[in-house]
């Protein structure tokens, strides 16, 4: 008997449901009356769930487990674990006995994303160059233990004088506190990155400290670290600021916005005045705010082609630049579902289900699943075509052999907006026509 489980651990977020996949190859003439299926914890051999004597014997594990009874006869012995907790992490063994027998262990890796870190300074006022300051970075309710990295404004790692502590709460989730002690320079940005090693999820925050000092004329150019996300057709503000020295006048200012990669000019300010847009007349500065050091750029009626990195270059006597990324997005429409053939359907027929969703960006991720939420990956063909505006139309085709009845769901995910659009179709065992006639 061949018992198969995934090689890689199943990763599940705390509070969600997880499927521990397990399958076996039933021999001809196999009936469920012959089947013994036992799920147990690999280490302690504690019983989790079982099927015997032709029936589901239920959960022995906090009533949070279930089998897929309709799929057992086809050799699907997978276990559904609901409302996953940190304590569930570990190895589960799937043991199948008919006449022959076999077992295999599947690992469950539990994870929880860390919150965006909060940053505190001590002392937090009247700071001067040369002062020692303690910066604390705190992030909460993550699992497993985090990796914490500190870096300066140039991305150079800061490793000295860092103390990190991680404490688990009653649910086993960790709160992380990392402390960096630094001697202040003329000014500086300090970033703390809390990484979840399982989810490869980074949560970061930064603090910029500008100590009181005699003006030196040095220009500091600042832009947001994270990409600016803008919906197609809306307006976006690419933020950029600089620190004007006392006595600064706009007549001294050169401000250039350009595309980072090609250096194509986008917008400029020089000779004391706005030189206007060199980018399809869709850009504007904030002229009333320039004297205060606000060099932000407004980009109107955003298009897919605008996506990329924009550099803000400021030159007075000193000079500096920084690049800000624009990430363009467009939500996908609710999928429409079509069946082929779409009438006189019977169990055993092969049917093609097409899921179509329109005018999204960037490319979508498409997932199919059955009525039990089990992913359907076989016999799926997905195509994505960009139109003239660069927006994608998605068509995903699933070929299935009809069972007695079944629900098939298609989920179209926009990875940038984290927006899910879904459609589903239910096919019953009786001869039927799709869509159902009124």
């Amino acid at each position: 008997l061949e018992v198969q489980v995934p090689e890689d651990p199943v990763v599940a977020l705390v509070g969600t449901d997880a499927t521990l996949c397990c399958s076996f190859s039933p021999e001809p003439g196999f009936s469920l009356a012959q089947l013994n299926l036992i799920w147990q914890l690999t280490d302690t051999k504690q019983l989790v769930h079982s099927f015997a004597e032709g029936q589901d014997q239920g959960s022995a594990y906090a009533n949070r487990t279930a089998l897929f009874p309709d799929l057992l006869a086809q050799g699907n012995a997978s276990l559904r674990l609901q409302r996953v907790r940190v304590a569930d992490e570990g190895s589960f063994t799937c043991f199948v006995s008919i006449r022959d027998f076999g077992s295999a262990a599947v690992s469950l890796q539990v994870a929880a994303p860390y919150s965006k870190p909060s940053m505190t300074l001590e002392p937090n006022k009247d700071l001067r160059p040369g002062d020692t300051v303690t910066i604390t970075c705190s992030s909460y309710q993550g699992y497993p233990e985090a990796e914490v990295f500190w870096q300066d404004g140039q991305g150079v790692p800061l490793t000295g004088n860092v103390t990190t502590s991680q404490m688990a709460n009653e649910q086993g989730l960790f709160d992380v506190h990392s402390i960096l002690r630094v001697v202040l320079g003329a000014n500086g940005t300090y970033s703390c990155l809390v990484r979840n090693p399982v989810l490869q999820q980074d949560a970061h925050s930064s603090v910029t400290i500008t100590p009181q000092r005699s003006p030196t004329g040095a220009v500091e150019v600042q832009v947001p670290e994270d990409p600016v996300v803008a919906l197609v057709g809306t307006d976006a503000t690419l933020r950029c600021s600089f620190s004007p020295e006392p006595g600064f006048s706009l007549a001294q200012l050169n401000l250039i916005w350009q595309l980072t990669d090609t250096k194509q000019l986008v917008h400029s300010f020089t000779e004391g005045r706005d030189q206007g847009s060199a980018y399809a007349n869709r850009t504007a500065l904030f002229p009333d705010l320039l004297a205060q050091g606000n060099a932000s750029l407004r980009l109107q009626r955003v298009r897919v082609a605008d996506e990329g990195s924009f550099t803000c270059f400021v030159s007075i006597r000193d000079f500096g630049s920084a690049a800000v990324s624009l990430q363009v997005a467009a939500p996908y429409s609710k999928p429409s579902m079509t069946l082929e053939p779409n009438k006189d359907l019977r169990p055993g027929d092969t049917v093609t289900i097409t899921c179509s969703s329109y005018r999204g960006y960037p490319e979508a991720e498409v997932f199919w699943q059955d009525g039990q939420g089990v992913p359907l990956t076989g016999n799926v063909t997905t195509s994505q075509m960009a139109n003239e505006q660069g927006l994608f139309d998605v068509h995903s085709v699933l070929r299935v052999v009809l069972g007695a009845n079944g629900t098939y769901s298609c989920l179209v995910r926009n990875p940038v907006l984290q927006q899910d659009a879904h459609g589903s179709v239910t096919i019953t065992g009786q001869p039927m026509t799709f869509p159902p006639e009124a």
Epitope: Q154, G217, V219, Q252, N254, S268, R317, D318, F319
Partner: antibody
Amino acid sequence: EVQLVESGGGLVKPGGSLRLSCAASGFTFSSYGMSWVRQAPGKGLEWVAAISGGGNYTYYLDSVKGRFTISRDNAKNSLYLQMNSLRAEDTAVYYCARQGLRVMDNWGQGTSVTVSS
Amino acid sequence: DIVMTQSPSSLSASVGDRVTITCRASENIYSNLAWYQQKPGKAPKLLVYAATNLADGVPSRFSGSGSGTDYTLTISSLQPEDFATYYCQHFWGIPPWTFGGGTKLEIK
């Protein structure tokens, strides 16, 4: 009076390294961006690298990017150019220059770099 | 990158002549242009900044003009000490801040 004095030039083999220094005086060094400019024998001026007053922004000529590093020590009123993986075409007189309001308003006397086997 | 095209590359003239050197940028540099004078074995010396402004101590026979992509350095009446090589340089946008190829002014 503004003064810029370069040093550190010399003869070096291809693939070798040199570090040029520029000592500044007569002005508030940390308030000014600085550049290095070079001039190959019998050729024109070529801008090489620039660094902002605080040292937090640096820019390079494409042909030296990854080989040369411009840096400064504002406490010592000094500008540096670390040159690695030197090539014959890097042979030149290297000048340091102070950036005024979008101009190089003061120049050093130059230091000579020869790359030859 | 912005390309600065300087012309002529060499020029012969006599004391007292009026001389014009031009510099053309490959795109609009919005008057962010400087002119330098260099004598053999010496460092360059600033003459004109922001296209039209004379640097301190530069004789009034030197003048700069132009806008957009086209700029001119004029010496109204050549003096013996003016024989040298002249360079333009732009300061528009993110470096490289390139120089023109130079104009060698020689005695006729």
